[in-house]
């Protein structure tokens, strides 16, 4: 019993004088609170309380319930307890079969004993079953069995109180303990796509998955920069313990224009948050962009060839898609195909392979592509560069010597001089006319050029040249000159 | 023996809200999980959702979403559910029962309140 | 949601028969489900949870089995105390009951 110095108030006195007295069942409970100042007497067994106004606590007819804490207390708030075991073979323990415990932390396995001097005081699997090899437990009459650290894998274990009551083992009712799971990382989030292009008015529908190992996750879907509650729906699986899922899925089910912007999914745990984004585009119509993967004027070379590819952004997704020359819609020799497989891909290629190109291929090619809301094209200037071909070398009647050529680009015309037998006809001529034939014809194709000299001028005999070139080659025609007494006679010209 | 222990019948006017609580006597309240079903006359049990109150985060039924909340209070081992914007359809008896969440079974349950929704 | 399918929605039985409750579950739920017993006036109580696990103070005479889509409770030897309503419950996703079977003296 406790003592204190004279003159302060000091916790009442209980008879008997025990901390702990062991009753048989059936025998009286008699306990007695002395104390000038007595208030109340308390009992306490398995969260269950009892009070009694009276100084003398008599229970006529124990029963093993009545095992528990009996506190005496004074107008002071001072007390003193016994504890009082009713021993009853046929009532070992008192149970309150609710067992839950929390990762880690631990938890008690509410089985008080209602006599102490039994052995063996411990937990034993139901069925015969063992414990598990690394659970830990710590006895104590009057409250329990204590497990240690709680882990995750006694979720739903079912276990008993044993202990020896003259030589034989009795176990109490069962027990299955609830684990409740720590949260040890930030919960999984994931979003069904990471981009959303819309027309105004079609639906907007996004599913944030949120995986953790309870269902007591917070989640939410939120507008960045805004705090308007969004509508979500929820679906959630429990696919083993630990293992929860939850979808929430946002709808707008018309979306406007001013709907465009990000979406994020927050989760959040005791761990700690995670979050992922989506982000939602919408405009008002559909739409191509046409983006030239090569220059849009190309200059290629008789006989090589060019691929002319085209890279374009479309939303719905096209349509049709054709390439077109000189009116005449080609059915081969092209390709379309997506930029990516991703379902949100807008972005597509288109190519046209142009091969052995000849000088009369020249021209405009024009992909066209559409979908439901819009058209568009973009056109190539397709040159084919060619060597120049001299078409005529002629004597003409009033003596002067002329020499047409074609080819891209705009061939020149020089000519030479070679006197006598030699074989470099170093000597140029100027030309008295050079004209463009065709310059106000088609853009495309070859360019014609006519040069023409004056014969009289050469006294001698000898060869003439007619040199026509351009970027890509040359080509020359010549003209033979004898003189015969006076008389000037041209021989036949030849390449 | 751990009890729930519900509050007394109510008689709502539609359009109105009603707090139902329920309180635990004993046990590890905070890591309980309580949920809250319901019963309209002559018909089936409906879960509407629950809560483990260690965590705070309450889990509702698709059906009850934006129209119920649960809550708990750790320090005097009490649940709460309230619903709002009452209709007649809601007239039913209100059960707290323990379990409900993360697979837990319905253990233990309250004796149920009876909510009135009338003009 | 997972629905709950329960039948019969009723039936009459004498005190001694057995008795057989099925419930199917519109999806796969592997073995959380739980079966209750309600008497007019009283709240439910649970007599089988994970599909087949006895709860304690529940006579042996009850019993549950399944797994899946397709569970049984079953009632070895009918006792006077046993006519009610049973419930079974499914805890993988939103929780959901069966439609209920009421029990009735034949």
């Known amino acids: 019993q406790p003592s204190v110095s004279p003159g302060e108030p000091s916790p009442p006195s209980i008879h008997p004088a025990k901390s702990e007295l062991i009753v048989r069942v059936g025998n009286e409970i008699r306990l007695l609170c002395i104390d000038p100042g007595f208030v109340k007497w308390t009992f306490e067994i398995l969260d269950e309380t009892n009070e009694n106004k009276q100084n003398e606590w008599i229970t006529e007819k124990a029963e093993a319930t009545n095992t528990g804490k009996y506190t005496c207390t004074n107008k002071h708030g001072l007390s003193s307890s016994i504890y009082v075991f009713v021993r009853d073979p046929a009532k070992l323990f008192l149970v309150d079969r609710s067992l839950y415990g929390k990762e880690d932390n631990d938890t008690l396995v509410r089985c008080p004993l209602t006599d102490p001097e039994v052995t063996s005081y411990s937990l034993k699997g139901c069925q015969g079953k063992p414990l598990p090899k690394d659970l830990r437990f710590v006895p104590d009459p009057k409250a329990g069995i204590t497990i240690k650290s709680v882990k995750r894998a006694y979720h739903r274990l079912c276990l008993h109180c044993s202990a020896d009551q003259e030589g034989k083992s009795v176990l109490s009712d069962k027990f299955i303990l609830k684990v409740r799971p720590a949260f040890k990382a930030v919960p999984v989030v994931s979003v069904s796509k990471a981009s959303y292009l819309l027309r105004e008015g079609e639906e907007f529908t996004v599913t944030c998955t949120i995986k953790d190992v309870s269902s007591s996750v917070y989640s939410t879907w939120k507008r960045e920069n805004s705090q308007t509650k969004l509508q979500e729906k929820y679906n959630s699986w429990h696919h083993g313990d630990f293992n929860y899922e939850r979808q929430a899925t946002l709808t707008i089910s018309s979306a406007r224009v001013n709907d465009s912007g990000v979406f994020m999914c927050y989760a959040n745990n005791t761990f700690g948050s995670a979050n992922v984004t989506t982000t939602l585009e919408v405009v008002d119509k559909g739409f191509i962009n046409i983006f030239p993967m090569i220059n849009t004027t190309v200059f290629v070379n008789d006989g090589e060839n060019v691929d002319l590819i085209v890279e374009y952004e479309a939303f719905p997704k096209p349509e049709h898609q054709q390439w077109i020359y000189m009116n005449r819609t080609f059915t081969d020799k092209w390709e379309d195909y997506p930029k990516s497989e991703n379902e949100s891909n807008i972005r597509y290629v288109s190519e046209l392979h142009l091969t052995r190109l000849k000088g009369t291929e020249g021209g405009t090619y024009t992909f066209l592509v559409s979908n439901s809301d819009v058209n568009a094209s973009i056109a190539f200037n397709v040159y084919v560069n060619t060597k120049p071909e001299i078409l005529t070398y002629d004597r003409l009647v009033n003596g002067m010597l002329q020499c047409v050529a074609a080819g891209f680009p705009e061939p020149t015309i020089d000519w030479y001089f070679c006197p006598g037998t030699e074989q470099r006809c170093s000597a140029s001529v100027l030309p008295v006319d050079v004209q463009t034939l065709n310059a106000s014809g088609p853009p495309f194709g070859k360019l014609v050029v006519q040069s023409s000299i004056d014969s009289s001028a050469f006294k001698h005999n000898g060869t003439v040249e007619c040199k026509a070139y351009n970027d890509v080659g040359k080509t020359s025609a010549y003209f033979n000159f004898a003189f015969k007494g006076n008389n000037k006679e041209q021989i036949h010209p030849h390449t | 023996q751990v009890q729930l222990v519900q509050s007394g019948a109510e008689v709502k006017k539609p359009g109105s809200s009603v707090k139902v609580s329920c309180k635990a006597s004993?046990?590890?309240?905070?890591?309980?999980?309580i949920s809250w079903v319901r019963q309209a006359p002559g018909q089936g049990l409906e879960w509407m959702g629950g809560i483990i109150p260690d965590f705070g985060v309450a889990n509702y039924a698709q059906k009850f979403q934006g129209r119920v909340t649960i809550t708990a209070d750790e320090s005097t081992s009490t649940a709460y559910m309230e619903l709002s914007s009452l209709r007649s359809e809601d007239t039913a008896v209100y059960y707290c029962?323990?379990?409900?969440?993360?697979?837990?079974?319905?253990?233990?349950w309250g004796r149920g309140t009876l909510v009135t929704v009338s003009s | 949601d997972i629905q709950m399918t329960q039948s019969p929605s009723s039936l009459s039985a004498s005190v001694g028969d057995r008795v057989t409750i099925t419930c199917r579950a519109s999806?796969?739920?592997?073995?959380?489900l739980n079966w209750y017993q309600q008497k007019p006036g009283k709240a439910p109580k649970l007599l089988i949870y994970?599909?087949?696990s006895l709860q304690s103070g529940v006579p042996s005479r009850f019993s549950g089995s399944g797994s899946g889509t397709d569970f049984t409770l079953t009632i070895s030897s009918l006792q006077p105390e046993d006519f009610a309503t049973y419930y079974c419950?499914?805890?993988?996703?939103?929780?959901?009951f069966g439609g209920g079977t009421k029990v009735e003296i034949k």
């Open positions: 029962a323990r379990g409900g969440l993360d697979t837990d079974e319905f253990d233990l």
């Open positions: 419950q499914q805890g993988v996703s939103d929780i959901t």
């Open positions: 994970a599909a087949s």
């Open positions: 999806q796969s739920i592997n073995s959380y």
């Open positions: 004993g046990g590890t309240f905070r890591i309980y999980a």
